[in-house]
């Protein structure tokens, strides 16, 4: 089981749509795959695909999942909040015929304030 | 460029252990993502899968011939190794690695091949 | 374990004419998760080892010459050659990888008349 995963980086301004993308391959067929995303090490959703389609359509605050066959797990987030910032990890398990698992590498979003002057006070604000 | 290339005893005695080595060139086998496999073909006949080994060190046998068969990894030389006990005449055959990945799952790449026989 | 079975074993053609191989499966490797056919379709050469022709039931390997042409789905699969040449002699293997352990079929040794 291989799992890819991106972008690494995703810069989007609050408001918009970020969209992560999660390619899982296998190089025999797999009754049941269970898929889990993550946000800085947090479980978002962890929903199974069987028969072509996902138990859950829903993955986080503003997330929705979908499967597009042969490969494709995307997760969009829309509309995208400042608290959509992190690190996103993609997660995959064949369950069925026999437990096999891999992990994506990160995907680092970052959301840019949609007023400039947030980000200034954001900045103004750190400690030192 | 990807190279397999086989190895091992062109004659072997019943009773006796086979073992054979694939040599991989210009590819790791610590690559993500792919299966090294051991096919063989009698003369004259279909060919046989005999077991794979994946990244992740999950083997997977034939399940008519589990009991005399182990396939393990060598990712210092970059080889995969196969062992087979109890030699039979009828286990004559030419003896082939290749390699599988996950993003389609054919076998790709082949060695040419080595010819094992099996005889006192 | 999946059975495949060629039809025929032996195929004498004239060169420039048509030939098709048949493959049946004894269960689907058809994946409605992945919508792919998990169905190979590989060429032995006199001498060689065997070489990918084919792979999900009907997409040519890379550097396969278009007369090769892979259709079917389920248990059900065809390997046609619109015009045979004198360089197709082999044996064809029908394979399947949707499960292990992988099966092949028996061959079809295609021969030129």
């Known amino acids: 089981l291989s799992v890819q995963q991106g972008p690494n980086l995703l810069q989007v301004r609050q408001g918009s749509q970020a969209t992560l993308v999660c390619q899982v391959d296998q190089a025999t067929a797999w009754e049941r795959l269970r898929v889990k995303w993550t946000k800085d090490g947090a479980i978002l959703c962890q929903p199974y695909i069987t028969n072509g389609s996902l138990s859950l359509g829903v993955c986080g605050p503003q997330g929705r999942l979908s499967w597009q066959a042969p490969s494709h797990l995307t997760l969009q987030l829309d509309p995208v909040s400042l608290n959509h910032s992190g690190a996103y990890v993609c997660w995959a398990a064949v369950e069925i015929p026999e437990l096999e698992e891999a992990e994506g590498n990160i995907t680092r979003l970052f959301v840019d304030p949609d007023d400039p002057t947030q980000n200034r006070n954001r900045i103004a604000s750190f400690p030192g | 460029q990807i190279t397999l290339k086989e190895s091992g005893p062109t004659l072997v005695k019943p009773t006796q252990t086979l073992t054979l080595t694939c040599t991989v060139s210009?590819?790791?086998?610590?690559?993500?993502?792919?299966?090294w496999n051991w096919i063989r073909q009698p003369p004259g006949k279909k060919l046989e899968w005999l077991a794979l080994?994946?990244?992740?060190?999950?083997?997977s046998y034939n399940p008519s011939l589990k009991s005399r068969l182990t396939i393990t990894k060598d990712t210092s030389k970059n080889q995969v190794v196969l062992t087979m006990t109890n030699m039979d005449p009828v286990d004559t055959a030419t003896y082939y690695c290749?390699?599988?990945?996950?993003?389609?799952?054919?076998?790709?790449?082949w060695g040419q091949g080595t010819l094992v026989t099996v005889s006192s | 374990d999946i059975v495949m079975t060629q039809t025929p074993l032996s195929l004498p053609v004239t060169p420039g004419e048509p030939a098709s191989i048949s493959c049946r499966s004894s269960?689907?490797?058809?994946?409605?998760?992945?919508?792919?056919?998990?169905l190979d379709w590989y060429l032995q050469k006199p001498g060689q080892s065997p070489q990918l022709l084919i792979y999900?039931?009907?997409y040519r390997a890379s550097g396969v010459p278009d007369r090769f042409s892979g259709s079917g789905s389920g248990t059900d699969f065809t390997l046609k050659i619109s015009r045979v040449e004198a360089e197709d002699v082999g044996v064809y293997y029908c394979?399947?990888?949707?499960?292990?352990?992988?099966?092949f079929g028996q061959g079809t040794r295609l021969e030129i008349k």
């Open positions: 394979q399947q990888h949707y499960e292990t352990p992988l099966t």
């Open positions: 210009g590819f790791s086998i610590t690559t993500g993502g792919y299966y």
């Open positions: 269960q689907s490797l058809f994946s409605s998760n992945t919508k792919r056919n998990y």
């Open positions: 999900h039931a009907s």
């Open positions: 290749a390699d599988m990945a996950d993003k389609g799952g054919w076998f790709a790449y």
């Open positions: 080994i994946y990244t992740s060190g999950r083997t």
